[in-house]
């Protein structure tokens, strides 16, 4: 993702509560940083349908975060 000026998060608003698993191409997690003070879960959709932000408080987001953290650490 390109860098934005300090204090600007990539996601706007609270995000969707869930995305159909079959529609997910990739999930990216952006951890709090100088650019944004909150965790952001960004879903890339299949068939070039763009990206959506997942509400980080949602059940699906928590599952994705756990899965990614297990894989990375």
């Amino acid at each position: 993702f390109p860098m934005f000026k300090r204090g600007r998060c990539l996601c706007i608003g609270p995000g969707v509560k869930a995305v159909k698993v079959a529609d997910i191409e990739k999930a990216s997690i952006m951890y709090p940083s100088n650019n944004c003070d909150k965790i952001e879960v960004i879903i890339t959709l299949k068939e070039n349908k763009g990206q959506r932000c997942l509400n980080p408080k949602s059940k699906q987001a928590r599952l994705i975060i756990k899965k990614v953290e297990r894989k990375n650490f």
Epitope: C9, L10, C11, I12, G13, G50, N55
Partner: nanobody, 126 residues
Amino acid sequence: EVQLVESGGGLVQAGGSLRLSCAASGFTLDDYAIGWFRQAPGKEREGISLITSDDGSTYYADSVKGRFTISSDNAKNTVYLQMNSLKPEDTAVYYCAAAQGLLLLSLWVPTQYDYWGQGTQVTVSS
């Protein structure tokens, strides 16, 4: 059923003001970002302003910055666009749209918005 209904358009002289309203039903504003777009004859739909009611963040296109102000009344489930110092080039049909899970990268991409109103005509005469 989700519905967005715009009102407040009309004919105004250059330099004048109008306030557009976007009444939402079937969902709460806190769950969505609400944007205003406009489309002039023969031109593409242009995103001009957006608000996220959950935290009150606002965004403006350069073409309206300093002249237009977006606000929301969560109790009325309504978003407003106060338009001041109107110019003839502001003449267009104005639409409000609702998006969930929007990214800053695709702020003004119409296809990223889930619901649209029917539009209200704004005409600015010189």
